[in-house]
Interface confidence: low
């Protein structure tokens, strides 16, 4: 008769580091002591006729245990295979590129340390929750890769790595481990340089707008812009509208920047840079300044009029040009009554890179002269009818402007000047029309001949 040695449990599965209670039993009536052969740490817990119970502790790896007993001088054996399962100790997705150009491939790499049994361990690479790759874990550590074509939609997307230990056939379920996610940043930077709109000329101490625009940029909000006039960085206001980035700044030229300069616009995204440069000439244009040696001159005095401007500026005073750019234009005159109120015009021209810039200035001369009455506007003999309305059309001139009064000789009777009045016979007579100012008096005699009103 053939006797058996049973080992229970048969082919157990347990988690790494766990303990196992093993029972060996036989139906042989004359069996000796049952022995357990294993490399694992074991302890005999109990035994009796035809059986023995052992405790196996700290089971870390797959193992085969063997029970043996002598029955009637012959050895009989029984065995059981222990399968140990363990979750991975480390699941890590390798760092992604800091910026990934859209339309180019990049590689996802996942490393898995530990985890058993390897035959039941699968590594999955994910974008959001979408599976990009599913591969078995082979070596230790297992390294799984996938090549992905970067798209705009990938910007900001989380990528992760997941391990699946499938112990469902053993009735233990599916054990999942996931790495920390890594976020991808994708970008598009066109090969074309930015469009830079800047003035060709900029006057010292003046401000002008500078606009720098780049289309087809993604994500525009992440781009860095550097705008500068020479080595002077400009404070730019950056705006994004869709895939267009616009930087606007105010360029103000300093005196020490005079001459040929460059306006530079750099747009940096994803570690790449696009640059535009425009030439600009910073110029200073002082004047023109028109001066009178005497703003208020006396009749007959000599007045000098001069016009000056900055270096390289050609001035022309009342049509007379200065000898050379940067020099003063001058003219002299003997002040006469006709020069009172005269304006002297000075135009200044500066050539900047082949373009001519023009500015004008003027000054007005005042000439002080004594009072005069214009005989042409003041008839010396007037024949008027009684009881009619007339105007004494006399005008005085002078600087300061004189007061004009017409008084009847031998009386203090005054007739209005320049405004209508009713004439009667009492107005008959000779009048002293006197223009007076702080610069003297001028008298003109006017005779009024009033013809009496006839009732016929």
């Amino acid at each position: 008769q053939e006797f058996l040695l049973r080992v229970e449990p048969q082919n157990p599965v347990l988690s790494a580091g766990g303990s196992l209670f093993v029972n060996c039993s036989t139906d042989c009536p004359s069996s000796e002591k049952i022995a357990l052969e294993t490399s694992l740490s074991k302890e005999l817990v109990a035994s009796g006729m035809g059986w023995a119970a052992f405790n196996l502790s700290n089971v870390t790896g797959n193992s085969r245990i063997l029970c043996s007993v002598y029955c009637n001088g012959s050895q009989i054996t029984g065995s059981s295979n222990i399968t140990v399962y363990g979750l991975p100790e480390r699941v890590e997705l390798a760092p992604l590129p800091p910026w990934q150009p859209v339309g180019q491939n990049f590689t996802l790499r996942c490393q898995v340390e530990g985890g058993s049994p390897r035959t039941s361990l699968t590594v999955v690479l994910l974008r959001w929750e979408e599976e990009l790759s599913r591969q078995p874990a082979v070596e230790e550590p297992a390294e799984v890769t996938a090549t992905v074509l970067a798209s705009r939609d990938d910007h900001g997307a989380p990528f992760s790595c997941r391990t699946e230990l499938d112990m469902q056939p053993q009735g233990l379920g599916l054990f999942v481990n996931t790495s920390a996610p890594r976020q991808l940043r994708t970008f598009v930077l066109p090969v074309t340089p930015p469009r830079l709109v800047a003035p060709r000329f900029l006057e010292v101490e003046t401000s002008w707008p500078v606009d720098c625009t780049l289309d087809g940029l993604f994500p525009a909000s992440e781009a860095q812009v550097y705008l500068a006039l020479g080595d002077q960085m400009l404070n730019a206001t950056v705006m994004n509208h869709g895939d267009t980035l616009t930087a606007t700044a105010t360029a103000t030229a300093r005196a020490d920047q005079e001459g040929a300069r460059e306006i530079v616009c750099n747009v940096t995204l994803g570690g790449e840079r696009r640059e535009a440069r425009e030439n600009l000439t910073v110029f200073s244009f002082l004047g023109p300044i028109v001066n009178l040696s005497e703003p208020t001159a006396h009749e007959g005095s000599t007045v000098t009029v001069s016009c000056m401007a900055g270096a390289r500026v050609q001035v022309t005073l009342d049509g007379v040009p200065a000898a050379a750019p940067g020099q003063t234009a001058q003219l002299q005159l003997n002040a006469t009554e006709s020069d009172d109120g005269r304006s002297f015009f000075c135009s200044a021209t500066l050539e900047v890179d082949g373009e001519f810039l023009h500015r004008n200035s003027s000054v007005q001369l005042r000439v002080l002269y004594g009072p005069k009455i214009d005989r042409a506007t003041c008839p010396q003999h007037l024949k008027w009818k009684d009881k009619t309305r007339h105007v004494l059309q006399c005008q005085a001139r002078g600087n300061p402007y004189p007061e004009l009064r017409c008084l009847k000789e031998g009386s203090s009777r005054e007739v209005p000047v320049g405004i209508p009045f009713f004439v009667n016979v009492t107005h008959n007579g000779t009048y002293q029309c006197q223009a007076s100012s702080s610069r003297g008096k001028y008298t003109l005699v006017v005779v009024m001949d009033i013809e009496a009103f006839s009732s016929h």
């Epitope: 709109v197 800047a198 206001t237 606007t248 105010t250 103000t252």
Partner: antibody, heavy 119, light 112 residues
């Protein structure tokens, strides 16, 4: 006296283009910036863009880029705005205005040009 | 873009009353040069807008002293000390610190 005189009202068909003008007088045309503003019932006042007559440089509101093109004719002291591919959304009153310093207020405005887009 | 929000939408007043209009910006209007480019315009019925106040508080030439502007950063106010019939119309605030320049939706000043 500063004046900005705009061209008369326009009735245009969808898909067409229109060019409106703004003639400046009473000041040196190249000394000030010309700006354009749209006024429609639904959206109030909207800034379209600006042009520097001296240099001919332009700055657009990105919303109107491709829709509006700003130009100047220095010889006649006139600013122009061309509106392309017109739709009913472009029906509005368009104003030109000027400003002196950068960036400063629009101190004088044209009387406005009414553009009606209708088939 | 700098969004300009005006309140109230409509402001019914009696002639001689005081009136106040508020304008708030979604971002600071202080320019890099230190100036604040916030302006007020009035559009009378059937007319173009006209400038009243520039750079927060400066009255444009010919604007009566009953108009005054104040504020800083993002909050601004236009005040009329005594409303007259010629003041009726729609008031707009506007900024030219940031491109694109933007306008408030307008406040209609009307007789009660």
């Amino acid at each position: 006296e500063v004046q900005l005189q705009q061209s008369g009202p326009e009735l245009v068909k969808p898909g067409a283009s229109v060019k409106i003008s703004c003639k400046a007088s009473g000041y040196s045309f190249t000394d000030c910036i010309i700006l354009w503003v749209k006024q429609s019932h639904g959206k109030g006042l909207e800034w379209i863009g600006k042009i520097n007559p001296y240099f001919g440089t332009t700055t657009y509101n990105l919303k109107f880029k491709g829709k509006a093109t700003l130009t100047v004719d220095k010889s006649s002291s006139t600013a122009h705005m061309q509106l392309n591919s017109l739709t009913s959304e472009d029906s509005a009153v368009y104003y030109c205005a000027r400003k002196e310093a950068y960036p400063d207020a629009m101190d004088y405005w044209g009387q406005g040009t009414s553009v009606t887009v209708s088939s | 873009d700098a969004v300009m929000t005006q309140t109230p939408l409509s402001l019914p007043v009696s002639l001689g009353d005081q009136a106040s209009i508020s304008c708030r910006s979604s971002q600071s209007l202080v320019h890099s040069n230190g100036d604040t480019y916030l302006h007020w315009y009035l559009q009378k019925p059937g007319q173009s807008p006209q400038l009243l106040i520039y750079k927060v508080s400066n009255r444009f030439s010919g604007v009566p002293d009953r108009f005054s502007g104040s504020g800083s950063g993002t909050d601004f106010t236009l005040k009329l000390s005594r409303v007259e019939a010629e003041d009726l119309g729609v008031y707009f605030c506007s900024q030219s610190t940031h491109v694109p320049y933007t306008f408030g939706g307008g406040t209609k000043l009307e007789i009660k």
